[in-house]
């Protein structure tokens, strides 16, 4: 029961985290105009990964996309890449984890297969979260570095336009969304990995033991699994495991990584 709860909670936390990573990536407020020196402006600037915007005191908002690829700073490109990789891995992880959920029955899938999928999705969530945290941190570092520069415009030359701007930029809401979302995805991934270890406890408490008879082999595994002889192909007992179809004999003859605690 605890394993199911851990797995379910891990899935939900990761889902929220990945939704947050997607939201952060799409948000325009990665950097916002620093208002320290001049707190009252009729025009407020903010910038995202894909476009920069102004919000006027009248409520009018105008955005301008970064219509160049080569003209953008390498660091910005790197941040974009990290966030996209994080989203892609997270999305795949979510897809895998749905099928891995203990509360969902799909055909005659073994718990060992679900454990494997849970571990895979957990690792994907961890990497996804790390990508998001890394991306946001790189951008934050870029902002800090640029903050003290005289022009303090981190996109100098963006779009092929030279800018003589005194505007300084500070952390935008998207950075905090990204950090929190990355952290949640990471935590969700860890929970999935923990849940993986607890799946099918009967299988995973002991190493599989094989008893070999002279005439034929009888593989025995504790936990109520029926013994099956080595005679015949035993094709009617094939199960999906570890990405491929194997007989029960094959499964029991080669202990998987889940057979050790």
């Amino acid at each position: 029961m605890a394993v199911t709860a851990c797995q379910g909670l891990g899935f939900v936390v990761s889902l929220i985290g990945i939704a947050g990573i997607i939201a952060a990536t799409c948000m325009d407020q990665w950097s916002t105009q620093d208002l320290y020196n001049n707190p009252v402006t009729a025009v407020f600037n903010y910038q995202g990964l894909w476009r920069s915007c102004v919000r006027e005191s009248s409520g009018f908002t105008e955005c301008r996309g970064y219509f160049t690829l080569l003209g953008l700073p390498a660091m910005l490109q790197a941040v974009r890449a990290l966030m996209i990789v994080g989203i892609v891995l997270g999305a795949i992880g979510l897809l895998v984890s749905i099928f891995a959920l203990k509360c969902i029955r799909i055909g005659s899938m073994e718990d060992s297969a679900k454990a494997n999928m849970t571990l895979t999705s957990g690792i994907m969530f961890i990497v996804s979260g790390l990508c998001a945290i890394a991306g946001v941190s790189v951008f934050a570092n870029m902002l800090v570095t640029n903050f003290w520069m005289s022009t303090a415009n981190m996109y100098t030359g963006m779009g092929g336009m030279v800018q003589t701007v005194q505007t300084r930029y500070t952390f935008g809401a998207a950075l905090f969304v990204g950090w929190v979302a990355g952290g949640l995805t990471l935590i969700g991934g860890v929970m999935m990995c923990i849940a993986c270890r607890g799946l099918a406890p009967e299988e995973t408490n002991y190493k599989a033991v094989s008893y070999h008879a002279s005439g034929h082999s009888v593989a025995y595994k504790p936990g109520g699994f029926k013994a099956s002889t080595g005679f015949g192909s035993n094709t009617k007992n094939k199960k999906i495991y570890d990405g491929g179809a194997r007989t029960e004999d094959e499964v029991q003859s080669y202990p998987s990584k889940h057979d050790y605690v």
Epitope: N45, C53, E56, S58, F60, C63, Q163
Partner: antibody
Amino acid sequence: QVQLVQSGAEVKKPGASVKVSCKASGYTFTNFGITWVRQAPGQGLEWMGEIYPSSGNTFYNEKFKGRVTMTTDTSTSTAYMELRSLRSDDTAVYYCARGGGPLRSRYFDYWGQGTLVTVSS
Amino acid sequence: DIVMTQSPDSLAVSLGERATINCRSSQSLFSSGNQKNYLTWYQQKPGQPPKLLIYWASTRESGVPDRFSGSGSGTDFTLTISSLQAEDVAVYYCQNDYYYPLTFGGGTKVEIK
């Protein structure tokens, strides 16, 4: 066509208050801000503040803060500017102008004809 | 407050000649968010309210003759009347539309020589 029609000239004594009106027509009143600018005789233009009828948000020039109040009546599409504690150096022509709004950037494209306020004892 | 400095104070130009008015702001009026300069030019004739000529430093208001053009970025801006006409005699003001309080230049009086 867009029109901003201001109230007539006023003569006030020092310490008194004046309330200038600006009636807008020819456009959706709530879609644009109203800015107030004054011009002392033979002098340049001085921005006093602006109000956005849709939200009621106001931005005042610190120089006039505490003495000026800008309001709007959306039912009559009229903007008001009240200046209190008048001094002789408040003698000027007061203009209202249509500013930016949620659908358009900020610049003053239409102006009222101006209201001359004379402060004299 | 942002100081807008216009030069010259007055300008006498022959009909059909070019008139150039300069405006300098104490801080950059360039907005990186939309790549626009929040500087506006107005024309004021005696006894009349100001008239919008150019906004965003270089965008001509509809109905304004194409002999009027604006240029510049950041802190330095120019209004050019390519071929002065008699009806262009007026005082021209530049205005900071970026920082509160919004401020106007002192004005440049354009006359016919």
